[in-house]
Structures are given as C-alpha cells and as structure tokens.
Amino acid sequence: NADGLKEPLSFHVTWIASFYNHSWKQNLVSGWLSDLQTHTWDSNSSTIVFLCPWSRGNFSNEEWKELETLFRIRTIRSFEGIRRYAHELQFEYPFEIQVTGGCELHSGKVSGSFLQLAYQGSDFVSFQNNSWLPYPVAGNMAKHFCKVLNQNQHENDITHNLLSDTCPRFILGLLDAGKAHLQRQVKPEAWLSHGPSPGPGHLQLVCHVSGFYPKPVWVMWMRGEQEQQGTQRGDILPSADGTWYLRATLEVAAGEAADLSCRVKHSSLEGQDIVLYWEHHSSVG
C-alpha cells in the first residue's frame, strides 16, 4: 500500500470506561489510524492530545474546538447515563464498557462506518444507520439500553454525522497530512540468537527483526532455497519509535542447524533481502 498501511485503512476512536462502584470511575479515550495511535484524551484538562505532528489532519482549530467540546460533554453524559441506568440494566459493579467507532477506507474511498459498544468484553449494542440496535445474544438488557439511547434522535443524528461525514473527511485529511510519515521506508535490522532449549539434543533458533516500517514483512528460516515450514512467526510488535519488531523461531536437532539461514524481505530493502546464516552466528547470548 502506498501509504505504508494495509488496506482497508480505518480511523477509529475507542472509549474504555471502568466503573468500579457507584461513584468511582475512570476512562481512557484514544484515536487510531489503523494500528497507529494518533490521538489521546487528557481527562484532567478535557482536551484532545495530538500525538503526531500531523494528527490535526486538515481540520480547522474551530472544528477541533467543537469536537473537543462534544467529546467532553458526551463523556460526562455517557458516564452519567450508564451510572443512572446501571441498576436497571443489571450492570454489576465493577464493570467495563468499551466503545469503538470510526470509518474504513478502501482504495481511497470510504467503504463504511461502525460504532459498537461492549459490556464486560461482550458485544452489547451497535449503531446502524441512525439508531442503536441490540446484539441478539445480549438479550433484554441490550434492548432496553437501545430504547434509552434512541429516545433522543437529535443526538443520534449527531452520531450519524460523525460517522458518515466527519470521520471520512478526517481520515482523508489525516492521510494527506501524514503522507510523508506514513509513506516512509525504514530498513530492518536482524540478528540471531538461541531460544530456550526445547529439549535434549534440540535447539531453538531465533531470528529477530526490528526497526522496520511499514508493517508488512516476510521472515522465514531457510535451508538453502527451501523454506522451513516449522518456522513460527511471533506477533509483529510495536516499538516506541513507531517502527515494528518481529521474531521467527525454529526448533531443530542440534546437528541440523549448520546450513540454516534466516531470510528477511521488506519493501525498504528494495529486493535486497537480508540473509543471516546460523553457522556465522556467535554462540554468545
């Protein structure tokens, strides 16, 4: 992908609210461009924190001010609403509410929007078109919650505008403003090490790949030109500097490690794969 992010691209905001008891609560709000966090919410000052220099996209200061006020008011209102209806909805303290909402982009065009609310980690209600609908598995509590949420159609209209207009406008502006950052190519570094011994007479070989951007990467243990199907790829993990880290492991009999190599393919390498040979690997570490 030209922007260094995998299709479909999305922008979404997550709200995680923890209700410990009737009066003690806490919330975390964050904004994400696919898997890159671009915004957070400072609860103390009730302000949006822009985590990247380009996180404002092409929105004016005035629109940001209005959105900030909307989030501030809705956070207060949501907390109060959930607290008020907790008993009626049979929400038992302590409980957690997770909300995620945003929009998706496919081939440069908006392909849809979403807004979902979960109770205790399970799907509860979602926003479709212009109203809240319960997930069938969530039962009568969710139906009642939707009845409450759908009392104010004007608020639902604002929510609809946020999803169908604001979010698509924002994601396009964000991609444009962050183009240089998102299209950058950062070469990976790779090194080999021993993993914990899998058993007598066996070795675990570890190939570490770090500092690469964008995220898509191919890492494989090889014997000559033969891919080793036993290669176990870990999760691609984020680094603090916005690059990625991955490790690939392979378990082999001690005498079969000599002619193995780790091959790394990444867009930044422009076809010049990194190949590290286990036999050249220092046994220290």
Partner: antibody, heavy 115, light 110 residues
Framework: SVEESGGRLVTPGTPLTLTCTVS????????MSWVRQAPGKGLEWIGI?????TTYYASWAKGRFTISKTSTTVDLKITSPTTEDTATYFC?????????????WGPGTLVTVSS | AVEMTQTPASMSAAVGGTVTIKCQAS??????LAWYQQKPGQPPKLLIY???TLASGVPSRFKGSGSGTEYTLTISGVQCDDAATYYC????????????FGGGTEMVVE
C-alpha cells in the same frame, strides 16, 4: 444564511405558518430551532427539528406549534394563535456537533395577534 | 423540563471592570450550557457553548465556567459595546428537557 418570513398581524384562532429559508448549508446535516421573544421579554425556546426530521417541543409548546421542513425551508405553524403569541420569532441553526446551541440566527419575523 | 434561573435580572457595570452573571439549573445538566448576548433589535449572538468553550470570533474577555447545576459567565475588562442582555440556555437533553433559556440579565455599562 437563515431568514424568517411570514410574520404579520393575525386575529386570534387563525392558524399562521412562519417559514425559515436557509442557504449555504443542508438541512439534512443540521438541526434547526425556533425561539420566540415577546416585546420587552426574554427568549423562549419553542422546539427543534433534527437533521433526520424528528421534532421535539418545549412542554408548553406541544399542541400549539408544529415544526416541519423541506429541503431548504423549516416551517413553524402556530395552530391557534392567542394574544400571548405576539412575539418576534427567530429561527436558528443548531451547530453541527451541538446538542442545542446555535451560532447562526435569522433576524426574526414579528407576529402580532390581535382582534 | 429543566428550569434555568439567571441572576441578577439587571446590573450596571463600570468600563474596565469585571462582572459575573450566574445561571442555576434545577438539576444537573452536565456542562450542557450556552451563553448568548443580545442587543436591542438584533438576534442573539452565541458567546459560549459546552459551559466553557468560547464561540468563534468572541473576545477572550468572555469566560464561561461551572458544572453540575451552577454556571457562571464572567466578563472582564468590560467595554461600552458589552451593554446588552445576556441569556443562558440549557442544551442537555433535547428530547426530555428541551433547550430552555434563563430569564436574561440586562447589563448597562457606565
């Protein structure tokens, strides 16, 4: 912009429809409110029509007023005016992300109810 | 419906001085409050929304604060042009509460 029209002298009980004509924005994206102000008195909120067309009224205004809209106009019908309905009627665009406040108001249209 | 009580009903202010207008809601409106300024023969002008956010083009001399049921509009460095009637408006829950206005505060500048 926002502009009200239709204000005039009417006799009590004669229905009257005020029209708010908008330009430069879409009524499918913005809610609109009606507010009135009797001579020398304060502002009184009558009701709102949401961008999707749902209407809400002040408790005192229910049954006395009806708000409706087309693609470029918002109407306020005073069903059976009384002398207490003599006022300047304002139409206001509710801000895009707003639960009710409005930054764009029309100049108002004067309705006088007298026999 | 929520009732909005505004105080004082009228006041006079000295040029350069600071004035405070209060608005009390009959129940918690969770910062869903706006302030307007209205001059004779004109429609109201939005000053503050969300209890404390300054509307576009409004001088920073105007400041909104408060939470729960108590809200305040403070005008510092009062100017002759500030002579007007000021209104608060509840914008909490349109469906249940309506967008009720306070009774207004008429401010004369001397």
């Amino acid at each position: 912009s926002v502009e009200e029209s239709g204000g005039r002298l009417v006799t009590p009980g004669t229905p009257l429809t005020l029209t708010c004509t908008v330009s430069g924005f879409s009524l499918s994206s913005y809610a609109m409110s009606w507010v009135r102000q009797a001579p020398g008195k304060g502002l009184e909120w009558i009701g709102i029509i949401s961008s999707s067309g749902t209407t809400y009224y002040a408790s005192w205004a229910k049954g006395r007023f009806t708000i409706s809209k087309t693609s470029t106009t918002v109407d306020l019908k005073i069903t059976s005016p009384t002398t207490e309905d003599t006022a300047t009627y304002f139409c206001a665009r509710v801000d895009y992300y707003s639960s009710g406040w409005g930054g764009l108001w029309g100049p108002g249209t004067l309705v006088t109810v007298s026999s | 419906a929520v009732e909005m009580t505004q105080t004082p009903a009228s006041m006079s202010a000295a040029v350069g001085g600071t004035v405070t207008i209060k608005c009390q809601a009959s129940e918690d409106i969770y910062s869903n409050l706006a302030w307007y300024q209205q001059k004779p023969g004109q429609p109201p002008k939005l000053l503050i929304y969300g209890a404390s956010t300054l509307a576009s083009g409004v001088p920073s001399r105007f400041k909104g604060s408060g939470s729960g049921t108590e809200y305040t509009l403070t005008i510092s460095g009062v100017q002759c042009d500030d002579a007007a009637t000021y209104y608060c408006q509840c914008t909490y829950d349109t469906s249940s509460y309506g967008n009720t206005f306070g009774g207004g505060t008429e401010m004369v500048v001397e």
